[in-house]
């Protein structure tokens, strides 16, 4: 199997999501990139860039914000304002088509918890669960892209390929992913 | 525990270059990026870029593009920072620092001890 | 390009409470976080994500925001936090404060 450590964030109300996502370059130069939330049995991709890419641009739908890296592999996403509901699983994936796309490694379980963003925390531990996926065929994945500029909303989707460097994991049942803990 | 080990102290003449290396251990190297900060006598802290070990991708500083590289050898989980064309500005303290998670560029928790780089004729 | 201001010194007596101010454009909406710096030391993360301490940082440091200005908080300070202390967010680079030289009377 493969096994997919998870990184938990701990926010109060009002604060903002900060997250980058790494990525291949080469294969995906004009791929759309999204960000998603696990939800119930599907994915939902909560934004998304457009084709074609353009110098890096960030690109706004709502409270979320996507900024590419163009020359580093490099995704940057922001949700500012956080609410207790935004908690749960999130992951940034490359889109390629309405059927397919490619997890980029770490998935992100978000806890958001009421009271002032101005109190002082304590330390967290980053990783926190360990997610297991059936095990598959590897394909390498190259290094080079340019960068989105407009972003859309998108239904859920229902077949994912899970992406790390060096390998895939095509999953033609979405729960396979999903079916995790998600607080500790 | 995670550690950072720069090299030792350079001094160099005005117009040569230099090479600080980082070697990590405590962790996976690929996983995590690797930024440099410098400081310079009586000036604050000043970042002039990050590598990904995992690509070897590198993203610097508008001020120090063009004469600054940074490079890894994965093979002895080694970073390095070189700069070329210096002059007596560059005399600084050279920092290697982690990101504290994969998913986040800052903030950096992990810090080496630092390498004095003297420029002078 | 993206600037993080600080105030170049505070002051404070022993035993009182020492603030130090980051201002920057939308930097409600970044995560913050704070160094210190002493003399011949490697600087040391004292907050990150705007109010989160890591482990082994005294509780009397603490971070907190105000719209754009994020503030570092030392209560209760000790001579031993005499240091110069950094702000810090990304903004497409990672970009520091000036610095704020801390002096405990």
């Known amino acids: 199997t493969t096994e997919l450590t998870e990184e938990k964030y701990e926010y109060k109300e009002g604060q903002t999501l900060e997250v980058k996502c790494d990525y291949a370059l080469e294969k995906y130069a004009n791929s759309r990139k999204a960000w998603q939330k696990m939800e119930g049995k599907m994915p939902k991709i909560l934004a998304k860039t457009e084709r074609p890419s353009e110098n890096s641009h960030p690109v706004q739908v709502g409270r979320i914000t996507l900024e590419d890296y163009p020359d580093h592999g490099l995704l940057q996403v922001r949700m500012t304002n956080l609410q207790v509901e935004d908690s749960g699983l999130y992951q940034c994936v490359i889109y390629q088509h309405p059927k397919e796309s490619h997890v980029l490694f770490n998935p992100i379980c978000l806890v958001v918890t009421k009271g002032s963003s101005g109190t002082p925390g304590s330390s967290e531990n980053s990783t926190q669960n360990v997610y297991r996926t059936p095990s598959t065929t590897a394909k390498a994945l190259g290094p080079r892209y340019t960068s989105p500029r407009t972003v859309t909303q998108a239904p859920p989707e229902s077949t994912v390929v899970v992406s790390t460097p060096g390998s895939e994991i095509n999953l033609t049942n979405v729960t396979d992913i999903i079916r995790v803990p998600v607080f500790n | 525990q995670v550690q950072l080990v720069q090299s030792g102290a350079e001094v160099k003449k005005p117009g040569a270059s230099v090479k600080v290396s980082c070697k990590a251990s405590?962790?996976?190297?690929?996983?995590?990026?690797i930024h440099w900060v410098r400081q310079a006598p009586g000036q604050g802290l000043e970042w002039m870029g990050w590598l990904n070990p995992n690509s070897g991708g590198a993203n610097y500083a508008q001020k120090f593009q063009g004469w600054v590289t940074m490079t890894r050898d994965t093979s002895i989980s080694t970073a390095y920072m070189e700069l070329s064309r210096l002059t007596s500005d560059d005399t600084a303290v050279y920092y290697c620092?982690?990101?504290?998670?994969?998913?986040?560029?800052?903030?950096?928790?992990?810090w080496g001890q630092g390498t004095l780089v003297t420029v002078s004729s | 390009s993206y600037e993080l201001t600080q105030p170049p010194s505070v002051s404070v007596s022993p035993g009182q409470t020492a603030s130090i101010t980051c201002s920057g454009d939308?930097?409600?909406?970044?995560?913050v976080c704070w160094y210190q710096l002493k003399p011949g030391q490697s600087p040391i993360l004292v907050i990150y994500?705007?109010?989160k301490r890591p482990s082994g940082i005294p509780e009397r440091f603490s971070g907190s925001k105000s719209g754009n200005t994020a503030i570092l908080t030392i209560s209760g300070t000790q001579a031993m936090d005499e240091a110069d202390y950094y702000c810090?967010?990304?903004?497409?680079?990672?970009?520091f404060g000036g610095g704020t030289k801390l002096t405990v009377l």
């Open positions: 939308k930097l409600g909406e970044r995560n």
């Open positions: 620092a982690r990101d504290q998670r994969k998913t986040t560029v800052t903030p950096f928790e992990y």
């Open positions: 994500q705007d109010n």
């Open positions: 810090q967010a990304w903004d497409r680079n990672v970009v």
């Open positions: 405590g962790y996976t190297f690929n996983g995590y990026y």
